[in-house]
C-alpha cells in the first residue's frame, strides 16, 4: 500500500553529479516523523535499501553514504517514508534523483561559437565537441540545478558534435559539459574544461535557468 | 589491478550443499556488484544472480530461485555463493564476476563435481 | 527471458581471414545491452565488446561489434593464431541476464 503519507525528499550531497571512486550522501528527509526510509533505485532488480530514520529539530532524515562511486550505483534513486514497522505502509515516492558517475572517458570540448564574449542581447550557441564517439553531450551550468542535453552529431572533421543554442544573451555564466554513451546513461565523460560566458552591457552574472531542463534532480535543501 | 580469486574444486553428494567463495582485491568491493556464471562441461555460460555488497540484496535467475543463496561480506571484501540440493546435472565450473550487466572481471572458476 | 541464437555454431578459418559472428536475440535488446566474450579452454571468458559496439580496455582493433534491437554482429577482421576460441553474446538489458550458445571459431 503506497501513499499513506506525503512524499519525503531525496537529494545528493555535494551533488548528484559524483566523480568515480568519490563520495556521495544520499539523505531522505522529511517534516513527517518517519520511522524507516526505504531507498530505491530503479532498474531491472531490486536494490532497496531500509534506513533507520533519526529525528531532529522537527524532522526526519536517513543518510546513505557511497564511500566509492562506481558505475553499478550509478541511476535513478527514490525514496519512501515507513511510520510503521510493515513494510506495506509506505509514503508516495520522493521526486526521482539521478545519480550520474563522471570522469569515466576523456572529456569533451566546450567553445562559444561567438567567442566567450558576447553583447547582451546577442544568440549564443555553446559547442561541445570530442573525438571520442559520444551519443549525448550534457551541458551544465555553475549554480544551476539541471543540464541541458542534446545528442551528438559526427561531423566531417572527424569529431562528434552538439551545438546548445542558449538564446539571446542576457547574464553570463560558467559552464561545462560531459559525453556519455546511450547504452550508459548514468556514465559521463571527464568535464570540459570550464567556460566563461561574459556578457557585455549587463552587469549580473547569472543565465536563466532553462525552461525546459533534460534532467531530474532533488530539492536543494542543505543536509543537517 | 582488480582480481577476483575462488576458492578450490569440491566433490558433492546428490542432496547436498556447496558454498564457493570469491575473495576481492584491488578495487572498491562494496560498490560493485559480483554475480556468479556457470558453465557445465562443453556447455555454455549460465548467470544464476548477483549481489551489491553495499545494498546486500541478492538477485537470482528464475531457474535457481529457492536453491541458490548469494551474500557477500564486506569486511574481508568476499562474496558467497551457496548451491543446494545438489544434483548431477549441477556439475559445472562456477565462476564469479564483476558486476551486473556486462562482466569486465572473472574469477578463476571453481569446478563442483556432483557424484554419488 | 531473451533467448539469443548463435550462428555459425562453428567457423573454420584461416589465420589473416576475416571472421562474422551473428547473435540473435528471441526480443529487442534494450539500449544495445549486449556484449562478446572470447573463452579459451580451461580459461574464464574474457569481455571483448560492450554496449554492442564498445571495445573493452585492452582488446585490439580488429575485433568490432555493431548491431541493435535483435541482430548483432561480432567481427573479426584479420585472424591471428590467438583468436581461434568460443565466442559468446550476452544480454544485460533485462533480467535474466542470458549468454547465447556460443560460436567456436577453429583453425581450417
Known amino acids: 500500500h503506497e501513499g499513506v503519507h506525503r512524499k519525503p525528499s531525496l537529494l545528493a550531497h555535494p551533488g548528484r553529479l559524483v566523480k568515480s571512486e568519490e563520495t556521495v550522501i544520499l539523505q531522505c528527509w522529511s517534516d513527517v516523523m518517519f520511522e524507516h526510509f526505504l531507498l530505491h533505485r530503479e532498474g531491472m532488480f531490486n536494490d532497496t535499501l531500509r534506513l533507520i530514520g533519526e529525528h531532529h529539530d522537527g524532522v526526519s532524515k536517513a543518510n546513505f553514504s557511497i564511500s566509492r562511486m562506481t558505475q553499478d550505483l550509478a541511476g535513478t534513486y527514490r525514496c519512501y517514508g515507513s511510520v510503521t514497522h510493515s513494510p506495506y505502509q509506505v509514503s508516495a515516492p520522493s521526486d526521482p534523483l539521478d545519480i550520474v558517475i563522471i570522469g569515466l572517458y576523456e572529456k569533451p570540448s566546450l567553445s562559444a561559437q561567438l567567442g566567450p564574449t558576447v553583447l547582451a542581447g546577442e544568440n549564443v550557441t555553446l559547442s561541445c565537441s570530442s573525438r571520442s564517439s559520444y551519443d549525448m553531450y550534457h551541458l551544465s551550468r555553475e549554480g544551476e540545478a539541471h543540464e541541458r542535453r542534446l545528442p551528438a552529431g559526427p561531423k566531417v572533421n572527424g569529431t562528434f558534435q552538439a551545438d546548445f543554442p542558449l538564446g539571446p544573451a542576457t547574464h553570463g555564466g560558467t559552464y561545462r559539459c560531459f559525453g556519455s554513451f546511450h547504452d550508459s546513461p548514468y556514465e559521463w565523460s571527464k568535464s570540459s574544461d570550464p567556460l566563461l560566458v561574459s556578457v557585455t552591457g549587463n552587469p549580473s552574472n547569472s543565465w536563466p535557468s532553462p525552461t525546459e531542463p533534460s534532467s531530474k534532480t532533488g530539492n536543494p535543501r542543505h543536509l543537517h | 589491478q582488480v582480481q577476483l580469486v575462488q576458492s578450490g574444486a569440491e566433490v558433492k553428494k546428490p542432496g547436498s550443499s556447496v558454498k564457493v567463495s570469491c575473495k576481492a582485491s584491488g578495487g572498491t568491493f562494496s560498490s560493485y556488484a559480483i554475480s556468479w556464471v556457470r558453465q557445465a562441461p562443453g556447455q555454455g555460460l549460465e548467470w544464476m544472480g548477483g549481489?551489491?555488497?553495499?545494498?546486500?540484496?541478492?538477485n537470482y535467475a528464475q531457474k535457481f530461485q529457492g536453491r541458490v543463496t548469494i551474500t557477500a561480506d564486506e569486511s574481508t571484501s568476499t562474496a558467497y555463493m551457496e548451491l543446494s540440493s545438489l544434483r548431477s546435472e549441477d556439475t559445472a565450473v562456477y565462476y564469479c564476476?564483476?558486476?551486473?550487466?556486462?562482466?569486465?572481471?572473472w574469477g578463476q572458476g571453481t569446478l563442483v563435481t556432483v557424484s554419488s | 527471458e531473451i533467448v539469443l541464437t548463435q550462428s555459425p555454431g562453428t567457423l573454420s578459418l584461416s589465420p589473416g581471414e576475416g571472421a562474422t559472428l551473428s547473435c540473435r536475440a528471441s526480443?529487442?535488446?534494450?539500449?544495445?545491452?549486449l556484449a562478446w566474450y572470447q573463452q579459451k579452454p580451461g580459461q574464464a571468458p574474457r569481455l571483448l565488446i560492450y554496449?554492442?559496439?564498445r571495445r573493452a580496455t585492452g582488446i585490439p582493433d580488429r575485433f568490432s561489434g555493431s548491431g541493435s534491437g535483435t541482430d548483432f554482429t561480432l567481427t573479426i577482421s584479420r585472424l591471428e593464431p590467438e583468436d581461434f576460441a568460443v565466442y559468446y553474446c550476452q544480454q544485460y538489458g533485462s533480467s535474466p541476464l542470458t549468454f547465447g550458445g556460443g560460436t567456436k571459431v577453429e583453425i581450417k
Open positions: 549481489i551489491i555488497p553495499i545494498f546486500g540484496t541478492a
Open positions: 554496449g554492442a559496439s
Open positions: 526480443q529487442s535488446v534494450t539500449s544495445s545491452h
Open positions: 564476476a564483476r558486476s551486473r550487466s556486462y562482466f569486465d572481471y
